[in-house]
């Protein structure tokens, strides 16, 4: 039973959409629709989203705001940005931790948990790439240490210790004559 277009108020475009009887202006971001307008191209009654809820975009039909997400403490997540009326909580990892995605095709909305970053210093290695979106990338052994198996071993401090070939190459100045 939709009528023809009115000569005075046009529902086309982004500003007005039909809500109930009339073409109404939408509610701004951070507001929900309490009641639609009561005249063509009129303003709807919009109310601010209550605490712990939000609406990120201008909207015409949302009669309630979305609940803000809670960061998952079990996954060691923290709130990087608190929820506001216009934006959801932004969850992430605290400094020294990185995001490990729980799905293979990782997107911004994918579930994740936080892992502690590798401490290259504690492993006696150079830090090649700092930990942020992925784990720390550790490089070669620090000066005074040589590559042995999976780890870095301290160069011998006395002439008593054995010094294999790799040790000799790195710790040559400490070698016995």
């Amino acid at each position: 039973q939709g009528g023809t277009r009115s000569p005075r108020c046009d529902c086309a475009g982004d500003f007005h959409k039909k809500i109930g009887l009339f073409c109404c202006r939408g509610c701004p971001a951070g507001h929900y629709l309490k009641a639609p307008c009561t005249e063509p191209c009129g303003n709807s009654t919009c109310l601010v989203c209550p605490q712990d809820t939000f609406l990120a975009w201008e909207n015409h039909h949302n009669s309630e705001c979305a609940r803000c997400q809670a960061c998952d403490e079990q996954a060691s997540q923290v709130a990087l940005e608190n929820c506001s009326a216009v934006a959801d909580t932004r969850c992430g990892c605290k400094p020294g931790w990185f995001v490990e995605c729980q799905v293979s095709q990782c997107v911004s909305s994918s579930p994740f948990y936080c892992q502690p970053c590798l401490d290259c210093g504690a492993l006696h290695r150079h830090t090649r790439l700092l930990c942020s979106r992925r784990d720390t990338d550790c490089g070669t052994c620090l000066p005074g240490f040589y590559e042995h198996g999976d780890g870095c071993v301290s160069c011998p401090t006395s002439t008593l210790g054995s010094c294999p070939e790799r040790c000799a190459a790195v710790c040559g100045w400490r070698q016995m004559f």
């Epitope: 039973q1 939709g2 009528g3 023809t4 277009r5 009115s6 000569p7 005075r8 108020c9 529902c11 007005h16 039909k18 809500i19 109930g20 009887l21 009339f22 073409c23 009641a35 639609p36 009561t38 005249e39 063509p40 009129g42």
Partner: antibody, heavy 123, light 107 residues
Framework: EVQLVESGGDLVMPGGSLKLSCAAS????????LSWIRQTPDKRLEWVAT????????YYPDSVKGRFTISSDNAKNTLYLQMTSLKSEDTAMYYC????????????????WGQGTSVTVSS | DIQMTQTTSSLSASLGDRVTISCRAS??????LNWYQQKPDGTVKLLIY???RLQSGVPSRFSGSGSGTDYSLTISSLEQDDIATYFC?????????FGGGTKLEIK
């Protein structure tokens, strides 16, 4: 052929409640907007409530807002008007009517009316 | 709210007469005007919408005109079946409002 049959009118005490019904046939009930209009003893017509077709938003004049509730049951093709805290000035003949959208989202005419049901609020 | 005024509450005319009923709005209503007929038994019928458009099934002796705030309903040749009360109504912003009605009687 569109048919609207109101029922539920009665004599009720001030402060009392009453629920009116309007059984509809001859059109796709769920997609049509419907209204209640009343005619007071001095024969004046007054718009009372409206429910929009499809999305079911409701509208009321200030005189009944908070006291009257319009609703519909698509399965039963029936429109309702729940009236509470009734006052003597609510005494009237109550009609239900379909509203025809003449201009999209702008302008309406009440194109089919029922025969009415009488409500008297008196002690 | 938009007030709708029908200054003539009752009107007497003879069969065959040309009858005009007027209606005034308290502000410009953009031709969003409807006319209704209420028979003595209480039956209500839409006659004219958007100032001058005839509702289907309504005899062509009924016509409407007007613009801005002033509108009128004309019956070109009065018939017995036209004995009724006629109401104007604005159908755009809420609250929808009606005129007080004009009761048409036979002389």
């Amino acid at each position: 052929e569109v048919q609207l049959v109101e029922s539920g009118g009665d004599l009720v005490m001030p402060g009392g409640s009453l629920k009116l019904s309007c059984a509809a046939s001859g059109f796709i009930f769920s997609s049509y907007g419907l209204s209640w209009i009343r005619q007071t003893p001095d024969k004046r017509l007054e718009w009372v409530a409206t429910i929009s077709g499809g999305d079911s938003y409701t509208y009321y004049p200030d005189s009944v807002k908070g006291r009257f509730t319009i609703s519909s049951d698509n399965a039963k093709n029936t429109l309702y008007l729940q009236m509470t805290s009734l006052k003597s000035e609510d005494t009237a003949m109550y009609y239900c009517a379909t509203q025809r959208e003449i201009y999209y989202g702008t302008y309406y005419a009440l194109d089919h009316w029922g025969q009415g049901t009488s409500v008297t609020v008196s002690s | 709210d938009i007030q709708m005024t029908q200054t003539t509450s009752s009107l007497s005319a003879s069969l065959g007469d040309r009858v005009t009923i007027s209606c005034r709005a308290s502000q410009d209503i953009n031709n969003y005007l409807n006319w209704y007929q209420q028979k003595p038994d209480g039956t209500v019928k839409l006659l004219i919408y958007y100032t001058s458009r005839l509702q289907s099934g309504v005899p062509s002796r009924f016509s409407g005109s007007g613009s801005g705030t002033d509108y009128s309903l004309t019956i070109s040749s009065l018939e017995q079946d036209d004995i009724a009360t006629y109401f104007c109504q604005q159908g755009s912003p809420l609250p929808w409002t009606f005129g007080g009605g004009t009761k048409l009687e036979i002389k």
